[in-house]
């Protein structure tokens, strides 16, 4: 039945069958000899969704994913046998699981896979224009995939390709122990995080990587990595996970005498996403699962949306927290974490911080150091032993904007769309879960824009069998959502206005920013349309005010809906 917009109960709950019957989902159920449709690359210009999977790369039409091209990229029988002899599973491990799929230039993609525990990369030709209809593997040009793709398909990789250079957070060894953030490709020697030092990285699980400008000077550009890792000894009693944001200067070329071919500007900080718990002890959501950057107006200051779960076996829950880049930068300009030895507590470093401040990008702006290779020895020495910041980054409003603790699922993915409505702009979140459902949630500002009320609009099952959602992309051009899992790929529209009913009141009560009552139906709201008779109230969901005007159907009868 109809539900008003309470946080815990969706306005609409649609089963997979109902989604199919109402033409609200298109599913690609995978190939018999493939799986793991986890690596997505959205190309709005070409209207394609590229998907890396087991032994295959797909190019789906954004209009309808039933229309696709595929590249088969398996490993040789010899390589597969070697993998099997090393004691690996022939089906789940001894194949080429695509982990990296990035735009390389106007005509090519760059792809890397696990290569049956022997990482390998190549280029994919996609042509200059969509009408070229080219999608083929450059068979003559294979490259070593170490430091780009992990050996083990179970391991996560975060990557970013900019200006011909690939930044990857991955494991660089066969056993998945040597985790690092690498920069490869390009004309320079590869650069990486310090080896064998748990203060830098401590068994990390990489989530994503993003380029964010600091100023109008491109020399100040930074690459930010989001990951979770084991808390460093002394940082926490017992074994714990911490969510992290790490920074690296794009123009970091390593040190001259120390930290040679290692990052000199790497810093990391903890991301906090917690709620006050009983006994004054906060309940932390530390297992960062996904990150989405909402770029709006100012690309230097995107809003960071993070999806977190709890690591506790007793208490299972998920949350979404929002962070501002100004808060992140403030932490990176704050005190460094320091301790005098393994048995000491971590404290804020109180001593003299060398100049230029470690973590600052070399540029004419600050200090006149043209390259990290010119940095003074004391800066490098300090940077090597102080990679972590003491203060954590707290979320906006100091609390999550979405919390789910009373359900049999956990959040896995998030994408966000900024929607223009009659009464302002709203961020609509699409949250993927580990049981193959997508939650559509709108955040509604209350007194201040960052003090938000969450309304759960829809809960949609997008795969036939419960399967964890592992990838999501949103096309604003097509107004479609694309979802990946082990089983396949699904496509669904961002809005289903007609499903909200045949009455103005129901359309209004839905509080869906995409939808408004147009006098005869609940339909997609376009702010540019000059129709006076558009009833919509996202902020309050009040049909009495909006559905009683002349010319607007004001019936308040509630129809039975999909539940």
């Amino acid at each position: 039945n109809y539900q008003n917009g309470k946080n815990n109960v969706p306005r609409l709950k649609l089963s997979y069958k109902e989604m199919l019957e109402s033409n609200n989902v298109i599913t690609f159920n995978g190939l018999a000899n493939s799986s793991s449709y986890h690596t997505f690359l959205l190309d709005e210009e070409r209207s394609r969704l590229y998907v890396g999977a087991k032994d295959h790369i797909f190019s789906f039409d954004l209009v309808n994913i039933k229309d696709f091209q595929k590249i088969v990229w398996p490993v040789s029988y010899t390589r597969r046998d070697e993998c099997k002899w090393a004691g690996k599973d022939i089906l789940k491990e001894c194949a080429n699981f695509i982990k990296v799929l990035k735009a390389y230039n106007q005509t090519h993609l760059y792809a890397c896979g696990t290569g049956a525990f022997h990482p390998i990369c190549t280029y994919i030709e996609i042509g200059h224009h969509p009408e070229d209809n080219i999608f083929k593997l450059e068979n003559s040009h294979f490259e070593n995939g170490r430091g780009k793709s992990p050996y083990d398909p179970k391991l996560l990789t975060a990557s970013l390709l900019i200006d011909g250079e690939l930044y990857s957070g991955t494991a660089a060894d066969f056993m998945g122990r040597d985790f690092a953030i690498f920069r490869t490709l390009g004309h320079h020697h590869p650069i990486r995080t310090e080896q064998h030092d748990s203060r830098w990285l401590n068994d990390p699980k990489f989530i994503s990587a993003h380029l964010i400008s600091e100023s109008d000077n491109p020399e100040d550009d930074k690459v930010y990595f989001f990951f979770r890792e084991n808390a460093i000894d002394g940082e926490h009693s017992g074994k714990a996970t911490h969510a992290r944001i790490g920074q690296i200067c794009k123009n970091d070329f390593g040190g001259h005498r120390s930290l040679v071919n290692k990052w000199t500007t790497f810093l990391k900080a903890r991301l906090i996403c917690s709620v006050p718990g009983p006994n004054g002890i906060d309940t932390h959501f530390d297992e960062l699962q996904d990150v989405f950057l909402m770029n709006f107006k100012d690309p230097k200051n995107p809003v960071v949306y993070g999806v977190f779960t709890t690591s506790s076996n007793i208490f299972k829950g998920s949350a979404v927290c929002m962070y501002s880049m100004s808060d992140v930068r403030r932490v990176f300009l704050g005190p460094y974490a320091h301790r005098d030895g393994p048995n000491y507590q971590w404290v804020p470093y109180q001593g003299r911080v060398p100049y230029p401040r470690p973590g600052t990008c070399p540029s004419k702006t600050f200090g006149g150091f043209d390259s990290t290779k010119d940095l003074p020895d004391d800066v490098i020495t300090f940077a090597r032993s102080h990679p972590a910041m003491y203060n954590p980054v707290f979320p906006m409003n100091n609390r999550p904007i979405v919390i789910k603790t009373d359900v049999n699922y956990q959040f896995t993915q998030i994408v966000v769309d900024r929607v223009d409505a009659e009464d302002g702009q709203y961020d609509v979140m699409f949250i993927g879960t580990d049981v193959g459902t997508v939650l559509k949630v709108v955040s509604i500002p209350k007194e201040t824009w960052y003090d938000l009320e969450e309304v759960l609009l829809e809960e949609m099952t997008v795969f036939r069998e419960p399967t964890a959602i592992s990838a999501m992309e949103l096309s604003t051009k097509q107004q479609q959502l694309y979802i990946g899992s082990t089983a396949g790929v699904a496509q669904l529209p961002l809005h289903r206005c007609d499903i909200y009913g045949k009455a103005c009141a129901e359309c209004c009560l839905a509080r869906d920013p995409y939808c408004a009552w147009d006098g005869s139906a609940c339909s997609r709201y376009f702010p540019t349309a000059k129709a006076r008779t558009r009833a919509q109230d996202i902020r309050n969901g009040d049909p009495l005010t909006h559905c009683s005007d002349g010319g607007i159907e004001g019936r308040m009868d509630h129809h039975h809906h999909h539940h």
Epitope: C83, W85, H118, P119, G145, R146, G147, D173, Q195
Partner: antibody, heavy 123, light 112 residues
Framework: EVQLLESGGGLVQPGGSLRLSCAAS????????MNWVRQAPGKGLEWVSG????????DYADSVKGRFTISRDNSKNTLYLQMNSLRAEDTAVYYC????????????????WGQGTLVTVSS | QSVLTQPPSVSGAPGQRVTISCTGS?????????VHWYQQLPGTAPKLLIY???NRPSGVPDRFSGSKSGTSASLAITGLQAEDEADYYC???????????FGGGTKLTVLG
Amino acid sequence: EVQLLESGGGLVQPGGSLRLSCAASGFDFDSYEMNWVRQAPGKGLEWVSGISWNSGWIDYADSVKGRFTISRDNSKNTLYLQMNSLRAEDTAVYYCARSGYSSSWFDPDFDYWGQGTLVTVSS
Amino acid sequence: QSVLTQPPSVSGAPGQRVTISCTGSSSDIGAGYDVHWYQQLPGTAPKLLIYGNSNRPSGVPDRFSGSKSGTSASLAITGLQAEDEADYYCSSYEGINPYVVFGGGTKLTVLG
């Protein structure tokens, strides 16, 4: 000029102990990972142990695990190998070697070696 | 027993070209780990000859070259000279029990 000078070798009885030292000069000792590699008379090279610049990572070959301890003192530019419960098969020339990590993939290459010190385990 | 396999000996006349092979497995050379080569002249400590499969440290003549393919690597010496007579060792990284592994060594004899 990079120099590594081992000392502390000698004759010791089975079950005995010995402590080897390696004095480093000509480079920033505290920036490099260091290793011990041994060579039994007339035989090939065998990696024994490695230690990172800040002693955060330490590892040993299976053949010496639990008996040998690697350590370093960056203030003295010195690498050590404490060898306990020595056996006849530990007889070898012990070399101190610096990890260069010169290659693209940071797989340890030993770019500088000491001249070695002979350890003989015999009754 | 060494993890990497090298021929015990090779020989060649001055001016000739010789190659030394080094065969590993899918968890060392075959897993993408780099191969390095060392030269040990009689009575001296080993010296790094080739690093990262094919790179020469400064001071090493260009008569020495290295290559790698699949699970094996090789060292080639052209224009053989009497002073090249030495033991040559390959090394790589063992991925399953992570540590450095060496080949058994190859004795190069320069004939005549």
